[in-house]
């Protein structure tokens, strides 16, 4: 008798893939644009990316540092209407793209809940929960909320309002710290809440590091469902040096767990290579024509265009990640397992009852690595193969489809592998 | 105009009880934070209690001195907040001052309460 | 708890002089820090919540500072109305504490 399926989990939209934040619209649309009505023509690239939500703003009304001149009901008209906010909703749902607002209340100013008046402050933000909840948003987004006093029990507020209007709507926190913690006190009394923070932002330096700091979180958050992001906010580029992005797009698509990706991390987009470009919201590079304060400073395989049409580019390799992690039941929910693969390296599985499994390894080094896999650290429901077939590599020259013995694994320098192999019973 | 009146202040023995209140007035008073302080001579200001909203379930934080003594409250019907104080002691004696917010906008001119024999 | 320190009971400064008071935490408290001014007589006057933020109708001659532990309420031209005590107060966390205070007096 052929064994019995296990019982699928509930899954949400989120769990389906990856986020994609927008924190500064003008910086997004670039040309002097930046409204809502300009956002909305911009959703097929969305959708071309396969992300499963929008995490949009803040756009509201905010008047630096001014509690009475924040009104976190009404859209700053820099950014549009309340007429083309409900367009653009109306738009992304037809596209199947969630949108999730961004709420931090004094985003203008220099501390983001103005470290006042919270009282005022937070029936601020229960109000405007309620009142986009009607409006359609599928989300929120709050930030820096290691500044918010007492953050916990406000978000579990916020929680209940989110989930008692819909089990289907969102609440992303966001905290600058990278401290396992603090971040663990923030979840502690929040179940649902989807936490980004700076905890992986020190992880580029060894395998061994960021295989420790992955395992130590999913231990410490047991069975909860964890997002995967560098910052709350920033860019990967403002962390990692070029020849990594790659390895973490690899990583942050099959580790379990949504993906949080800040717009522009898809081309690798880096601020430090657009001089007089602020480090947290630079010009979004569309083609050559977008940043055209210093004529020859952007070439084509920096920008979309350039790399739409590249299909070793770093665009083309988050869009088969992005695909392949909406699609595939063991890289959507399936179980994780990191075992050794020898120093410098971090690898892991991805398993689903009968479904394909997975094995990434991965090269954080600047040498080329053979992989020593040790099968004998992996349950018996998770044991390797001798071959697994190669779906892709971070570095071009590898034949993909091919089946490669996982005893004779060698990576190049800053290489990952994402291989697929079948349940066998 | 906002406007806050704290009142039974008075002298009370030493283990005596007393209940002080402070009407509100010019805000939304079911939407802040209301705080009571107290000033003396001695200690300088000294925060006391706090209670927050309905929406926080009415939450209450006391200063260690007056932790099992002591008693916030609030009728949101009514746009008063109550302090009920026991067991008072001499180290209690001072002004208190009922504030809204967080922290105090606005004060009420105070209270005197003296514990003595 | 967390404990705050106001380095100078007492200040005497001319009129027309720059006046600085500094407040010191014993910990973090994120720029939750408030600077209250009170006259003999009279209740407590907020002046600035969240380190800097000014509230309406104080005059701009005053300023706060500071981040992390550190802050500073400053005045940049001493008037003769600006005589009283000054206290800083924490609201980062319960149990809310104040500072010592300090008496600007006029020399």
């Known amino acids: 008798r052929a064994p019995r399926c296990r019982e699928l989990p509930a899954q949400k939209w989120w769990h389906t893939g990856a986020l994609y934040r927008i924190g500064d619209l003008q910086a997004f649309q670039g040309h002097g644009a930046g409204n809502l009505a300009g956002l909305k023509g911009r959703l097929d690239y969305l959708s071309s990316l396969k992300v499963k939500g929008l995490v949009l703003g803040p756009i509201h009304k905010n008047q630096k540092d001014d509690v009475a001149q924040t009104d976190l009901l009404q859209i700053d008209p820099n950014f549009g209407s309340k007429e083309d906010f409900d367009s653009l909703l109306q738009s992304a749902k037809k596209k199947s793209i969630r949108v999730i607002l961004d709420l931090t209340p004094n985003y203008r100013g220099e501390n983001s809940w103005f470290s006042t008046q919270v009282d005022t402050v937070a029936t601020k933000v229960k109000d405007a929960l309620e009142f986009w909840l009607q409006a359609g948003v599928d989300g929120f987004q709050v930030r820096d909320i290691e500044n918010l006093k007492d953050a916990s029990s406000f978000l579990a507020e916020w929680q209940n309002i989110t989930k008692g209007f819909s089990e289907d709507r969102l609440l992303i926190a966001g905290t600058n710290s990278s401290d396992l913690q603090q971040i663990l006190s923030l979840l502690e009394s929040n179940k649902d809440l989807l936490l980004t923070s700076s905890y992986l932002s020190d992880s580029g330096s060894t395998g061994e590091h960021t295989k420790s700091l992955v395992t130590q979180y999913l231990n410490a958050t047991g069975n909860r469902w964890c997002s995967w992001s560098l910052s709350q906010a920033r860019l990967l580029t403002s962390f990692l040096p070029a020849q990594l992005l790659r390895l973490y797009q690899l990583m942050l698509f099959t580790l379990p767990g949504t993906p949080v990706f800040s717009y522009g991390d898809e081309i690798g987009l880096d601020a430090a290579a657009l001089p007089g470009q602020p480090m947290e919201a630079p010009v979004m590079l569309w083609d050559e024509s977008s940043f055209p304060d210093i004529p020859g400073a952007v070439s084509a395989n920096m920008t979309v265009k350039g790399q739409s049409e590249d299909p070793g580019s770093l665009l083309s390799l988050f869009r088969r990640l992005s695909d392949q992690r909406s699609k595939e039941r063991s890289l959507l929910h399936g179980d994780f397992h990191a075992f050794s693969a020898g120093p410098g390296l971090f690898s892991y599985i991805r398993h689903w009852d009968q479904n394909e499994r997975f094995l990434v390894v991965l090269n954080f080094g600047d040498v080329g690595l053979s992989a020593g896999l040790q099968a004998s650290d992996l349950p018996a429901s998770a044991s390797l193969p001798a071959k697994a077939d190669l779906l892709l590599s971070t570095q071009p020259g590898r034949e993909e489809g091919s089946p490669l013995e996982l005893e004779r694994l060698k990576l190049e320098p800053h290489e990952g592998l994402l291989l697929r192999f079948p349940y066998a019973a | 105009e906002v406007k806050l009146e704290e009142s039974g202040g008075g002298l009370v023995q030493p283990g005596g009880s007393m209940i002080l209140s402070c009407v509100a007035s010019g805000f939304t008073f079911s939407n802040s934070w209301m705080n009571w302080v107290r000033q003396s001579p001695e200690k300088g200001l000294e925060w006391v209690a706090e209670?927050?909203?309905?929406?926080?379930?009415?939450?209450?934080h006391y200063a260690e001195s007056v932790k099992g003594r002591f008693t916030i409250s609030r009728d949101d019907s009514k746009s008063t907040v109550y302090l009920q104080m026991n067991n008072l002691r001499a180290e209690d004696t001072g002004i208190y001052y009922c504030?809204?917010?967080?922290?105090?906008?606005?004060w009420g001119q105070g209270t005197l309460v003296t514990v003595s024999a | 708890d967390i404990q705050m320190t106001q380095s100078s009971s007492y200040l005497s400064v001319s009129l027309g002089n720059r006046v600085t008071i500094t407040c010191k935490a014993s910990d973090h408290i994120k720029n939750w820090l408030a600077w209250f001014q009170q006259k003999p007589g009279n209740a407590p006057r907020l002046l600035i919540s969240?380190?800097?933020i000014l509230e309406t109708g104080v005059p701009s001659r005053f300023s706060g500072s500071g981040s992390g532990k550190d802050y500073t309420l400053s005045i940049t031209s001493l008037q003769t109305e600006d005589v009283a005590t000054y206290y800083c107060q924490q609201y980062w966390s319960t149990p809310y504490t104040f500072g010592g205070g300090t008496k600007l007096e006029i020399k």
């Open positions: 504030s809204r917010g967080d922290p105090g906008a606005y």
């Open positions: 209670i927050r909203l309905r929406s926080n379930n009415y939450a209450t």
């Open positions: 969240g380190a800097t």
